[in-house]
């Protein structure tokens, strides 16, 4: 099929286009090109007769067209009007006609765009800026670039006017950037030159450097001021409110104590009309100043707060030193020094961090020490302790209980009896008590600073008769030759005698037996299996006496070296071998057997029927006590004769 291909399809003004013919039939008489989508003699561009090789211009011929023998048409120096359809009319030798239509589009070659702005010096946080890409061109696409990147997504950036206008609302100093616009159509793309947005801002609050505020007499004072500003700020210095000079730097050589005072830097921006000031207080010491310690928290709470201790004053080129409890700083993950060693931070203070703390400033000749300081760490209250520890009293005596809980500030105490508030004192005194004074005595300690409270409850029994005592033990299953056991006779009662019996006998004299705590506690050191006896304690006073139920001590021991029975070691072939192993142990041990080193069974008895000489060898019994963690074994040789 006859087709027309336009090369290129999109043609720039002034360039050329080739209408290329494909599938041209054979045996042609000639052909003609027409402007438009149909054959119209009034719009003929050119005709061509193959036989004569004669080209004849038509009414639409502009002088820019060239026809080729292969019927292709070249149009040069394209103008906008050339846009549209072109029809090729082919006349074959048999006078049968054939037509094909092609088309192309003409676009202008875009000029280099430029950016116009409605505000050349916008003020930060106040003005908006609208950039417009010039010129306005039909059928062109507009793009924008910021610092050679595509536009960022921002609510302050808005495109309008077919993307030809870029508006920046509420400009900031960060909008100071290189802006470019680009125009594109199908035949060209052009970028503008950069436009730098010049945002006026500031001045910000000036910074005076160095930060050092303490100087020694005779030094030079050289202060520099800087404030972020566009255009650059104009600077003025004031000392104690009096104008000095309009420079960015203030230099005073060989200062004296009289140069102490407030130094103000004023920064002025002539375009924004704004002024900002910063004041620093300079102290000039006649001699090295005595350092002192300041704290960011004068009442830190234990296990909650961190405390930063700072060595004052701050002096340039100075080494700072610290001591705690008259020692150099210990290595601790809770102690941190700042880079310049001037600040010591205690992370998560405890009541043991009170100090004292000292800091020092090292100069060429000596170290100047601060006065020591201590920390007031708030803590507690801990669980209160009620003393004395007696729980049994006889009627008629005075009951005097004292309560104490570690706390800072000191705890405030309250006493409750059977849940009823009695008094707000550290001590509770009741004279001439009776059985009615028996009950639950609660001491409540309150820390007013932290708001925390802790309580301890004590049961007080007032009785003429002593109660039946009981024995408590600190170790219910002691291991032989290793552990000690402390038996305590409960309860603790006032004016009471404590007695002990072992297997119904009074205590034997032994260096391993020790009485303490007013005979209330009986300690057995290095227990042995022979200590596994019945222990009884007794209490008595002038009115009554009572004994506890016996407590039997369960001593863990063994396993001892095992014994294999029967003792025989020679057997006749065909006999039964029946070996039994036994070891003294508490609790009973676990047994296992090995024959010639090969594990057999985990039983106390080893039985082999109808033995032969093949059963000769070493028979080992192993014993293990899981409670004591100890092991033992014995080996026996067995000979079987034929």
């Amino acid at each position: 099929k006859l087709t027309i291909e336009s090369t290129p399809f999109n043609v720039a003004e002034g360039k050329e286009v080739l209408l290329l013919v494909h599938n041209l039939p054979q045996h042609l008489f000639g052909y003609s090109w027409y402007k438009g989508e149909r054959v119209d003699g009034n719009r003929q561009i050119i005709g061509y007769v193959i036989g004569t090789q004669q080209a004849t211009p038509g009414p639409a011929y502009s002088g820019r067209e060239i026809i080729y023998p292969n019927a292709s048409l070249l149009i040069q120096n394209i103008i906008q009007n050339d846009t549209g359809f072109y029809t090729l009319h082919v006349i074959k030798s048999d006078l049968v006609n054939e037509e094909a239509t092609g088309q192309f589009r003409v676009y202008p070659e875009l000029p280099k765009p430029s950016i116009s702005s409605n505000n050349s010096k916008p003020v930060e946080d106040k003005d908006a800026v609208a950039f417009t890409c010039e010129p306005e061109t039909q059928d062109a696409t507009y793009l924008w670039w910021v610092n050679n990147q595509s536009l960022p997504v921002s609510p302050r950036l808005q495109l309008s006017n077919g993307n030809r206008t870029l508006t920046l609302f509420n400009v900031t100093r960060n909008d100071t950037a290189s802006y470019k616009c680009e125009t594109q159509n199908p035949v060209s793309a052009r970028r503008s030159d950069s436009v730098i947005l010049n945002v006026l801002y500031g001045p910000d609050a000036p910074t005076i450097s160095p930060l050092n505020t303490s100087y020694r007499s005779g030094e030079n004072l050289n202060l520099s001021c800087h404030a972020a500003s566009n255009p650059p700020a104009q600077y003025s210095w004031f000392v104690n409110g009096t104008f000095q000079q309009s420079t960015q730097e203030l230099f005073i050589p060989n200062i004296t104590v009289n140069n102490s005072g407030s130094y103000t830097c004023q920064a002025h921006n002539s375009d924004t009309g704004l002024n900002r000031t910063t004041v620093t207080t300079i102290t000039v010491y006649a001699e090295p100043p005595k350092p002192f310690i300041t704290s960011n928290n004068s009442n830190p709470v234990e296990d909650e707060d961190a405390v930063a201790l700072t060595c004052e004053p701050e002096i340039q080129n100075t080494t700072y030193l610290w001591w705690v409890n008259n020692q150099s700083l210990p290595v601790s993950p809770r102690l941190q020094l700042s880079n310049d060693n001037r600040t010591l931070t205690l992370l998560s203070v405890t009541r043991n961090d009170v100090g004292p703390y000292e800091c020092g400033i090292q100069n060429e000749l000596s170290v100047d020490h601060s006065d020591p300081v201590i920390l007031n760490v708030l803590y507690g209250p801990d669980d209160p302790t009620i003393s004395p520890s007696y729980t049994y009293y006889r009627p008629g005596v005075n009951l005097s209980l004292s309560c104490h809980a570690a706390s800072n500030p000191p705890a405030q105490y309250s006493w409750l009896i059977d849940g009823n508030i009695q008094q707000h004192t550290q001590e509770l005194f009741i004279s001439n008590i009776t059985e009615k004074n028996s009950g639950l005595y609660t001491c409540q300690a309150n820390n007013s600073a932290s708001g925390h409270s802790r309580t301890t409850v004590k049961t007080i029994t007032v009785s003429a008769e002593l109660p039946k005592p009981s024995i408590s033990s600190n170790n219910s299953k002691p291991v032989e030759d290793k552990d000690a056991v402390a038996f305590t006779c409960e309860p603790e009662a006032q004016n009471t005698t404590y007695l002990w019996w072992v297997n119904g006998q009074s205590l034997p004299v032994s260096p391993r037996l020790q009485l303490s705590n007013g005979n209330r506690t009986l300690t057995l050191f290095n227990v042995t299996r022979n200590d596994a006896r019945a222990y009884v304690c007794g209490i008595q006073n002038s009115v009554s006496a009572n004994r506890s139920d016996p407590v039997t001590l369960d001593v863990l021991y063994g396993p001892d070296t095992p014994i294999i029975s029967p003792p025989d070691s020679s057997y006749l072939s065909g006999a039964n071998l029946n070996l039994s192993c036994h070891s003294a142990s508490n609790p009973s041990p676990q047994y296992s057997w090995r024959i010639n080193g090969i594990p057999q069974q985990h039983t106390q008895v080893l039985f082999i029927a109808k033995i032969t000489p093949n059963n000769n060898g070493t028979y080992a019994c192993f014993v293990s006590n899981l409670a004591t963690g100890r092991n033992n074994s014995i080996v026996k040789s067995i000979t079987v004769s034929a």
């Epitope: 004068s298 006065d371 201590i374 507690g380 500030p409």
Partner: nanobody, 120 residues
Framework: EVQLVESGGGLVQAGDSLTLTCTSP????????MGWYRQAPGKQRDLVAD?????????NYADFAKGRFTISRDNVKNAVYLQMNNLKPEDTAIYYC????????????WGQGTQVTVSS
Amino acid sequence: EVQLVESGGGLVQAGDSLTLTCTSPTLTFTPYRMGWYRQAPGKQRDLVADISGGDGRTTNYADFAKGRFTISRDNVKNAVYLQMNNLKPEDTAIYYCNTYVAIVGHARSWGQGTQVTVSS
């Protein structure tokens, strides 16, 4: 603010004894080294004796106090004591107690003190 309360002073004869007591409702003395100080009219405040924190096993005395004065502490009662024996007229002064060194972040505040007057 740290509040310190001194008590136990009074007018006594030369050779008599007195026991001064120091407590505080706002500061727990337990961890701190504590001191008794005195200030006679027209003179500066001087350290009389000090006692280490915790169990108070370490004590120090000014020369004039050695052998006559005893400093002690009771952490349960949050109290520091100064037992003064064989008092002399030159012991007449206002007696103060305080932590041995300043507490950081707190102005060094002193209590009212307790007046001790020894007549000959």
